[in-house]
Interface confidence: low
């Protein structure tokens, strides 16, 4: 019968001919009376056999990631009679893995959006690298993820690639972060290969800033001839937030005379001071009112940022008009 062990050849072998093993018939007494032949895909080009001894060699560098298995056939013939000594037999050569592929992030580019001020532990995104090496061969394709850039705001779970928030972030200070993740094979042992990816993490706005008046005092004038409903000037607050979180409502906080009103221009986010009652220079030639500004939408959980509304003082001078 045929005698052989399982055949393995390491991929990427640099030797010009690498001895894989020996195929022989147990009838072969070593007197060179038998001839061994190799048939099938790769025979003669990738693999050769010593016709006298049955020793098999690989004569080409093999890439396991391209092809991991070769199925060949062996024959043994008695040189004197030309007859087969053994029935033709099929055998397998397996290409064994070496760690020659670095992990690759195939879903790049990564981008995620997370609300600013999210608590520690909030899941941002999961990045996944794949390694073309053999997952069943040692640790060649066992990956560990680590953070190269992004501390102290982000962390990555070493075995899953899940990125989480590790420190609260304020969009008004920085609205996006570049996180660099490394995936290392061989579970980080010597000889490990690595790949990196960048993750753009954008912070979405939450209403964590109240509007604040740019001026603590505004001076306006109104003619005593102005009819009610006249716009006598504008006031403006600044809100570090954006979008609907920066929409604001102006209102009167103090106006003993009840002469003025403030309406909000929701296009420009300005407060328009309106004359509610006609004024009379001879009766009162100046007024002092206090205005306040608040955000339009403030979720309950963000009320702590909006405890005291910003206020401003408005001095209004009445202009005299000659009366007949």
């Amino acid at each position: 019968g045929w005698v052989w062990n399982q055949f393995f050849v390491p991929e990427e072998m640099n030797t010009t001919s690498h001895h894989i093993g020996q195929l022989r018939s147990d009838l072969d007494n070593g007197n060179n009376s038998f001839q061994y032949k190799l048939l099938g895909a790769g025979a003669g080009s990738t693999f050769i056999i010593d016709e006298r001894t049955g020793d098999i060699y690989a004569i080409q560098k093999l890439d396991r990631e391209e092809r991991s298995l070769y199925i060949l056939r062996a024959q043994v013939i008695d040189i004197a009679t030309g007859r087969a000594v053994e029935p033709e037999s099929e055998f397998v050569i397996k290409v064994s893995d070496i760690n020659d592929n670095e992990p690759k992030f195939l879903d790049e580019p990564y981008e995620a959006i997370v609300p600013e001020m999210s608590p520690e532990g909030t899941l941002v995104i999961q990045v996944t690298a794949s390694d073309a090496d053999d997952p069943s061969s040692g640790n060649n394709a066992r990956l560990l993820y680590s953070l190269l850039q992004g501390q102290p705001y982000f962390s990555v779970e070493p075995t899953t690639g899940v990125i989480r928030i590790s420190s609260k972030m304020d969009r008004e200070l920085q609205d996006e972060y570049w996180v660099i993740i490394q995936a290392k094979d061989m579970i980080g042992q010597p000889g490990a290969l690595s790949g990196t990816t960048s993750v753009l993490i954008k912070l979405s706005d939450v209403n964590d800033n109240k509007p604040i008046f740019k001026e603590s005092l505004y001076r306006l004038t109104v003619s005593e001839s102005a009819p009610t409903g006249t716009s006598i000037g504008t006031i403006m607050a600044y809100d570090n937030d954006i979008g609907e979180n920066a929409e604001m409502d102006y209102s009167i906080e103090e106006d003993d005379s009840q002469t003025f009103d403030i309406i909000t221009n929701h296009e420009t986010q300005e407060g328009i001071v309106i004359l509610k009652k006609k004024v009379d220079f001879e009766h009162q030639n100046h007024y002092g009112i206090r205005a306040k500004v608040k955000n339009h939408h403030v979720p309950e959980q963000l009320m702590k940022y909006h405890t005291e509304a910003s206020t401003t003082f408005i001095k209004i001078q009445v202009e005299d008009v000659d009366e007949p």
Partner: antibody, heavy 120, light 110 residues
Amino acid sequence: QVQLVQSGAEVKKPGASVKVSCKASRYTFTSYYMSWVRQAPGQGLEWMGIIHPSGGDTTYAQKFQGRVTMTGDTSTSTVYMELSSLRSEDTAVYYCARGGIKLWLHFDYWGQGTLVTVSS
Amino acid sequence: QSVLTQPPSASGTPGQRVTISCSGSRSNIGSNFVNWYQQLPGTAPKLLIYTNNQRPSGVPDRFSGSKSGTSASLAISGLQSEDEADYYCAVYDESLQGWVFGGGTKLTVL
């Protein structure tokens, strides 16, 4: 982290022009203003002007009006500052600095600076 | 002559508290947010305090800013040798329609 990388040092003769570049990366280039600030040897910081890269809107300091031109190229995320009719007093380190999303918000990131020497 | 006035120099011994003032007018400090920059020798300026009193991440809480009316100040407590640098205040000026810097204050740690 936001990065602003400026072009290298220049030596110019009086009357010539200089064009300094500032390449931005790792943020949305078109969202933020970019200012140019200079610093003469041993002197303080002097604001020259500001550009919004998305529309190319510019505001220049009165002192540099007519001599300075700021431009932006959104395809390469680069802003440029050109100063003409150079004189020896223009010898300085020129910095680009990223502004805010509003004209009056702080400069949070600065380039490494470009030394421009004006000498005959 | 700068639009914003700062003392040209300030000094203190390690551990001490020093304050640098910045005086302006209604059209700049009186109307807008004050920012402070630190410039270590031979390097580009770095944002130290923004919108009057906010610290960017990485800036120690030894640095604090405040504003009142048309003046602002930067306070450094627990002074350290690495704080030796030039400090500039900066603000947007509504009248000039542009940014203005203080003349800078050279801080020496004795």
